[in-house]
């Protein structure tokens, strides 16, 4: 007799989702043997690198890559040695590079290169850093949400595969520069460029998806700031008891906030702002990010942009789920529904910032941005996308799913590394003995 | 020119309550500002106390929360200090000082920074009998 | 309450030396991307004086010989050549949660 190796029992990927604010880095794990099963990858643990995003090294590309080491490091502790050369590595950027390559295409080329250059000395099988589409970003969100959940395919007890008869959920992701909408349609799409055509399972699905640039949390805020320095003298959305500085040119330098800027400015100018808490000038603020005077389609959301109605279920994740988590949580109030929601947002507006701390204590200067984060949610959802009561009864605000963290960064590797086969595995399962 | 000075009794008896008062030169303490104290045990790091903002709002450190009161006269532009029942152990130098939020820039993202950039010379306060 | 630890308690240099500070939080510090810490400088009978702020960023005035870096829990405050003025006491400060904390100091005396 002979000893015969039995094939490892798991493989790993990995994927570093460099976001507006910062990165995370993912290890995903799946059973070798059921890699076409749906579910069945998970998240084997994650890491923040710590300090901002990549796009804020545009100054100092080589710090990009330097702070990726820490996490990177974790990466060859969490992944045994064994796999690390069989492990595929993947960095997707998001719209805070989509934002730098808008305003310094070389600087962009100069971070991605940088961490490329840092990814590389790992013993993982590196595939690639590149700046993912806006599209890109919601159709992956899309289908992490629906492989956790188990919406594309199911087991049956007799070793057969078999469609669900659920629907898919539309995933709904609030970023830091961006947010996208993705879901299920049944009709074709007006604007071809919001249509993704999709075989998974040997099942087709038509997927409406849009990403707004400057929507993301991060820059809505920035947006309201420079719209608060231009029509008040104080901020609205900020509460009362709340003052800052602002030196001009930290206002005005994104890209989202061109509109807002002045034809002449100071930029090195401090302004000193104070917060109002007042609900009602900070709805009109908020509502004045979204246009809805032209819309060349049957049907829009916002700015022109077409949109069929939304259907089905929905998963809200990211800075969605941490803003009405701090509703839920933090603050003790009920947002079940539409109503309900915006009577939270109102609430949180009108608490002084004195109210804000001691209703949460140990917090700092985030607690500030709750109010205008709350009432952004809220209008983006009711008028924005177009949720009336009966259909935001079908939205759920959850961050993970099968203890996986929701997002793009599942369903890029999914994709990349042909987890999800477009055809259903053609025999049932059993077990090789060759 | 901004400019802070605190003023009070430099001994103090255990049990009593300890009183400085600040007083600010050169900007309104109604201004946009929060008024903070600061204290410095001998030979030991700083603890911030509590502070009174433009806006009137207190913010104490819970670790003294039910000893400490800031208040303020505005037409003095002058805000103070008064800690309670005292003991040896709130022997220290005091330091009154303006802080803000200062606005910063981030990877796309903004945020607030609490900075306290103007300060006064220090009073030292000896708790004794 | 969030706890800084800074070392060492006390550094001797030389005039042209590197100074290098260390400052350890119990827990991150870090929001979103953003460092919420601040370094002070004190002299002997003086008010303390802001130096750093955000982690990195230089308060106007304050010479280029300083910098600051580092994030989640760990920070450090380099002096790249010390001068004669720079001998002083400096201190770290979080303003991440609150209370605010400062760090226990650590004296930059001469060699």
């Known amino acids: 007799t002979r000893d015969i190796r039995e094939p490892p029992a798991l493989k790993y990927g990995i994927v570093l989702d460099a976001g507006s604010s910062h990165t995370s880095m993912f290890i995903y794990k799946w059973p070798a043997d059921k890699e076409n099963d749906t579910g069945i990858v998970g998240q084997h643990s994650s890491c923040d690198v710590p300090g901002g995003g990549i796009s804020s090294y545009a100054d100092n590309p080589s710090g990009a890559g330097q702070s990726l080491v820490g996490c990177l490091e974790q990466a060859l502790r969490d992944v045994p040695k064994e796999r690390h050369a069989g492990t595929p590595l993947y960095l997707g950027a998001t719209a805070g590079m989509r934002l730098l390559n808008l305003t310094n295409p070389e600087a962009s080329t100069s971070v991605l290169t940088a961490v490329t250059h840092t990814l590389t000395q790992y013993p993982f099988d590196f595939r690639g850093a590149r700046i993912l589409s806006g599209q890109e970003e919601g159709v992956f969100g899309w289908v992490t949400a629906n492989y956790l959940l188990e919406n594309f395919i199911k087991y049956g007890w007799v070793g057969r595969w078999f469609r669900p008869r659920k629907g898919t959920l539309g995933a709904m992701d609030l970023g830091g520069a961006s947010t996208q909408i993705t879901f299920e349609t049944t009709s074709p799409a007006e604007d071809r460029a919001s249509e993704v055509q999709l075989r998974l399972y040997g099942q087709h699905y038509r997927v409406y998806t849009h990403s707004f640039l400057c929507y993301g949390r991060d820059q809505v805020l920035q947006r309201l700031l420079a719209s608060a320095l231009q029509t008040h003298s104080f901020h609205p959305c900020w509460p009362r008891g709340f003052s800052t500085h602002v030196l001009l040119g930290d206002v005005y330098q994104s890209p989202c906030t061109v509109a807002q800027r002045p034809q002449t400015f100071n930029s090195s100018a401090r302004v000193s702002l104070s917060g109002s808490s007042d609900p009602h000038l900070c709805r009109d603020l908020v509502s004045g990010l979204f246009s809805f005077s032209s819309c060349p389609f049957s049907r829009c959301s916002f700015n022109g942009v077409f949109q069929p109605p939304v259907a089905g279920n929905f998963i809200a994740f990211s800075a969605f789920f941490y803003t009405v988590n701090f509703l839920r949580t933090s603050m003790g109030l009920p947002v079940a529904t539409l109503q309900q929601l915006e009577a939270a947002a109102v609430n949180v507006c009108n608490q002084t910032w004195a109210q804000l701390q001691a209703r949460v204590p140990g917090q700092q200067a985030h607690l500030a941005d709750y109010c205008a984060g709350a009432m952004f949610v809220q209008q983006l959802l009711s008028r924005g996308y177009g949720f009336d009561e009966r259909a935001f009864g079908g939205v759920i605000f959850q961050k993970k799913a099968a203890d996986t963290a929701v997002g793009w960064a599942l369903g890029y590797m999914l994709n990349l590394t042909n987890l999800i086969p477009a055809d259903p595995p053609g025999l049932r399962k059993g077990t090789d003995f060759s | 020119q901004v400019q802070l000075q605190e003023s009070g009794p430099g001994l103090v008896k255990p049990s009593q309550t300890l009183s400085l008062t600040c007083t600010v030169s050169g900007y309104s303490i109604t201004s946009g500002y929060y008024w903070n104290w600061i204290r410095q045990h001998p030979g030991k790091g700083l603890e911030w106390m509590g502070y009174i903002s433009y806006d009137a709002d207190n913010n104490y450190n819970p670790s003294l929360k039910n000893r400490i009161t800031i208040s303020r006269d505005t037409s003095k532009n002058q805000f103070s200090l008064k800690l309670s029942s005292v003991t040896a152990a709130d022997t220290a130098v005091y330091y009154c000082a303006g802080g803000y939020y200062r606005y910063g820039l981030g990877s796309y993202s903004g945020s607030y920074y609490y900075v306290m950039d103007y300060w006064g010379q220090g009073t030292t306060v000896t708790v004794s009998s | 309450d969030t706890q800084m630890t800074q070392s060492p308690s006390s550094l001797s240099v030389s005039v042209g030396d590197r100074a290098t500070i260390t400052c350890k939080a119990s827990?991150?510090?870090?929001?979103?991307?953003?460092?919420?810490m601040n370094w002070y400088q004190q002299k002997p009978g003086k008010a303390p004086k802001l130096l750093i702020y955000a982690a990195s960023n230089l308060e106007s005035g304050v010479p280029s010989r300083f910098s600051g870096s580092g994030s989640g829990t760990d920070f450090t405050l380099t002096i790249s050549s010390v001068q004669p003025e720079d001998f002083a006491t400096y201190y770290c400060q979080q303003s991440n949660e609150d209370p605010p904390t400062f760090g226990g100091g650590t004296k930059l005396e001469i060699k």
């Open positions: 827990q991150s510090v870090d929001y979103e991307g953003h460092s919420y």
